[in-house]
């Protein structure tokens, strides 16, 4: 009796159990009865990734200098090309088709996290006691200057945008 | 017993096209692919590319393109090798083969003898 | 694409000679995918060892194979007459498929 489902790595045709492809090759015949399943490796701009009866290999995914994008890494018979975006740069989705510049955070607020190649950076308000004076991708806010250590008192007090301003203690005569 | 049986030696003048055929039989055609490849002085053996007999897709190897073309007939068990815009290049024999289950290459035609001359 | 470097190009032995044909790959390749012909004048090429040490149906045991990554070899531990041809290995591993240039082995 002719089988109705078959065993993994096989696919059924023509009331036939056949192998499929493994990764990295596509399929050229299927097999019959007398003869085995005919595949066909991928060249090397191509991929597959899994067991499959594909008749075309995929190309492997282009990173586009001109949208920002590197090789991250390199695809082979089995593995799809890896893009991530130049230095400044981050991807704009997941599936990473184009890069937009690492936004900088703005005067009163800090970087919590550094953009990566596919992250963004994260911004966050100075709190009390911290400061940030620059629109930067790289700077944390910083803790104002503490006038006490230097012998000298606040003249004028700090906000998230500016440290305080320190000066001589008044002299009793 | 399988026999690759391909058309007679071409003598044909640069600029031109020609289309060279394999017929397969003593097994069911559309069991395997048919794979071609050139045979010159000057380059030993290339492998033009292959045909999916059953699929009808072709896949080429990229030096090939635009210069080859594969084609099947099924109803006649007959694959074809067409060559475009001959040039002195194209000089070269040109086989058929057939993959068995242990290289893809156990069963060759006899050969054709391809010569561009004006 | 991979290139198959076959040495020597040409060769000549006497009969009862050990005769070694080597082939190095580009890049490395599966050893289920090298597999070696022979041609002589005249005639298609003709299977002899496949999946690098396989000999092909009614092949002389005189004939082997053997090699892996990117460095595979022929041998015919007795050269006779009737093996004066050209021998060619032939990768499947990658697209395209490729072949060394072949090496000549003449009788002495």
């Known amino acids: 009796e002719p089988p109705t489902a078959c065993r993994e790595k096989q696919y059924l045709i023509n009331s036939q159990c056949c192998s499929l492809c493994q990764p990295g090759q596509k399929l050229v015949s299927d097999c019959t009865e007398f003869t085995e399943t005919e595949c066909l490796p991928c060249s090397e701009s191509e991929f597959l990734d899994t067991w499959n009866r594909e008749t075309r290999c995929h190309q492997h995914k282009y990173c586009d200098p001109n949208l920002g994008l590197r090789v991250q890494q390199k695809g082979t018979s089995e593995t799809d090309t890896i893009c991530t975006c130049e230095e400044g740069l981050h991807c704009m989705s997941e599936s990473c088709e184009s890069c937009v510049p690492h936004r900088s955070c703005l005067p009163g607020f800090g970087v919590k996290q550094i953009a990566t190649g596919v992250s963004d950076t994260i911004c966050e308000p100075c709190p009390v006691g911290f400061f940030s004076n620059v629109s930067s991708a790289f700077e944390k806010c910083r803790p104002w200057t503490s006038c006490e250590t230097k012998d000298l008192v606040v003249q004028q007090a700090g906000t998230n945008k500016t440290d305080v301003v320190c000066g001589p203690q008044d002299r009793q005569r | 017993e399988v026999q690759l049986q391909q058309s007679g030696a071409e003598l044909v003048s640069p600029g031109v096209s020609v289309k060279i055929s394999c017929k397969g039989s003593g097994y069911t055609f559309t069991d395997h692919g048919m794979h071609w490849v050139k045979q010159s002085h000057a380059k030993s053996l290339e492998w033009i590319g292959v045909i999916s007999t059953s699929y009808g897709v072709a896949t080429y190897n990229q030096k090939f393109k635009g210069k080859a073309t594969l084609s099947v007939d099924k109803s006649s068990s007959t694959a074809y090798l067409e060559l475009a815009r001959l040039t002195s290049e194209d000089s070269a024999i040109y086989y058929c083969?057939?993959?068995?289950?242990?290289?893809?290459?156990?069963?060759w035609g006899q050969g054709t003898t391809l010569t561009v001359s004006s | 694409q991979i290139v198959l470097t076959q040495s020597p190009a040409i060769m000549s032995a006497s009969p009862g000679e050990k005769i070694t044909i080597t082939c190095s790959a580009s890049?490395?390749?599966?050893?289920?995918?090298l597999h070696w012909y022979q041609q002589k004048p005249g005639f298609s090429p003709k299977l002899l060892i496949y999946r690098t040490s396989n000999l092909a149906s009614g092949v002389p045991a005189r004939f082997s194979g053997s090699g892996s990554g990117t460095s595979y070899s022929l041998t015919i531990s007795s050269m006779e007459a009737e093996d004066a041809a050209t021998y060619y290995c032939?990768?499947?591993?990658?697209?395209?498929?490729?072949f060394g240039a072949g090496t000549k082995l003449e009788l002495k």
């Open positions: 890049s490395s390749i599966s050893s289920n995918y």
């Open positions: 083969a057939r993959r068995d289950s242990k290289s893809p290459f156990d069963y």
């Open positions: 032939h990768q499947y591993h990658r697209s395209p498929l490729t």
